[in-house]
């Protein structure tokens, strides 16, 4: 079994990002009904069964490290309260740590594969679409917050892959 | 694509301290570290430390800490590498380096050095 | 903290010729951390192997990576004259995170 407590620690530090996330809200969703859009997240790829330790944990470090890069850009320095980027920060630097030292041993266990190229990649796309979203619309008051509301939804569809972790553990 | 633009060279006295400066440009994220790393003349690698401006947090090698400061502008993004108690075998080209946002799975991103920059010589000489 | 052994220090060889450079760690590597770099003279290092056998944007496919545990391989099957230069191997571990680098190898014309 793996010396790291990787479901307890995530999960919480998930809970503290989707917290973080709510208080970021600027602008009401209602009012920016005309700017929704389909991200088309890649659910099937957090629903399967397939994934080895190491290929699940390497999925969710993407989805973080990708939010991350996304919320530490220029553009989003202004769009948010520097306060509650530095907590989402924060957060999400603490996850990304949590998993990598997970990855670091189950990697040794059976010398599993570190990844699925193919959802590793659908989940680039997805933030690729997100990126061009925000690109399209001039990174608007809107456009920010329906992609807020995106991460949000997001997040939570990547529990089920934390959830199958915790019963791997 | 990253590019990495260090500070120019420099001569020190032993004893003083020398801060080097690289500014990345490009396709740049806060949310990746930016390393030194530095190579005595005729030598090999050697990794010093690490910053992610995000954040400003830091990683020491061992070797140096207690005598070393990485520091971090956010924006423009540039990394600072302040060497201080400067010694003769502190004659080296400092590099700055970061990872690519473009590996595959992200996860391997940060435990390499895809971009570098050109370099900065510090002589440390009397 | 690993220890990095690369041998030899250098390789003198013709152009054409194929050439196995060896990178020893001092403890087990996931192959998954190790890689490859190239050094010219007076440029700076090119990121050439990552995640011991894939190769980076650019890279030639004659050049190769391969191991696992402590013992890892770079593979030039047939040396162009731009190949020869320095070749470093390096580490990542973590928490916390350290780098570590072998002391290189140098492939020279013969």
């Known amino acids: 079994s793996l010396d790291c407590d990787l479901p307890q620690t995530h999960s919480l530090g998930h809970r503290r990002t989707m917290m973080l996330l709510a208080q970021m809200r600027r602008i009401s969703l209602f009012s920016c009904l005309k700017d929704r859009h389909d991200f088309r997240f890649p659910q099937e790829e957090f629903d399967g069964n397939q994934f080895q330790k190491a290929e699940a944990i390497s999925v969710l470090h993407e989805v973080i490290q990708q939010t991350f890069n996304l919320f530490s850009t220029k553009d989003s320095s202004v769009a948010w309260d520097e306060r509650l980027l530095d907590k989402l920060y924060t957060e999400l630097y603490q996850q990304l740590n949590d998993l990598e030292a997970c990855v670091m041993q189950e990697v040794w266990v059976g010398g599993t594969p570190l990844m699925n190229e193919d959802s590793i990649l659908a989940v680039r796309k997805y933030f690729q679409r997100i990126t061009l979203y925000l690109t399209e619309k001039k990174y608007s008051p809107c456009a920010w917050e329906v992609v807020r509301a995106e991460i949000m939804r997001s997040f939570s569809s990547s529990r089920n892959l934390q959830e199958r972790l915790r019963r791997k553990e | 694509e990253v590019q990495l633009l260090e500070s120019g060279a420099e001569v020190k006295r032993p004893g003083s301290s020398v801060r080097v400066s690289c500014r990345a440009s490009g396709d740049t994220f806060s949310s990746y570290p930016i390393s030194w790393v530095r190579q005595a003349p005729g030598q090999g690698l050697e990794w010093m430390g690490r910053?992610?401006?995000?954040?400003?947090?830091?990683n020491y090698a061992q070797n140096f800490r207690g005598r070393i400061t990485i520091t971090a502008d956010k924006s423009p993004l540039t990394a600072y590498l302040e060497l201080s108690s400067l010694r003769f075998e502190d004659t080296a080209v400092y590099y700055c380096?970061?990872?690519?946002?473009?590996?595959?799975?992200?996860?391997?991103?940060?435990?390499?050095?895809?971009?570098w920059g050109q370099g900065s010589l510090v002589t440390v000489s009397s | 903290e690993i220890v990095l052994t690369q041998s030899p220090g250098t390789l003198s060889l013709s152009p054409g010729e194929g050439a196995t450079l060896s990178c020893r760690a001092s403890q087990n590597v996931s192959r998954h951390y190790l890689t490859w770099y190239q050094q010219k003279p007076g440029q700076s290092p090119r990121l050439l192997i990552y995640?011991?056998?894939s190769r980076a944007t650019g890279v030639p496919d004659r050049f190769s990576g391969g191991g696992s545990g402590t013992d890892f391989t770079l593979t030039i099957s047939r040396l162009e004259p731009e190949d020869f230069a320095v070749f470093y191997c390096q580490s990542y571990h973590s928490p916390p995170p350290v780098y570590t680098f072998g002391q290189g190898t140098k492939v020279e014309i013969k």
């Open positions: 995640g011991g056998s």
């Open positions: 910053i992610l401006p995000a954040l400003g947090v830091t």
């Open positions: 380096a970061s990872p690519s946002a473009d590996i595959i799975p992200s996860i391997l991103g940060t435990t390499l050095f895809a971009f």
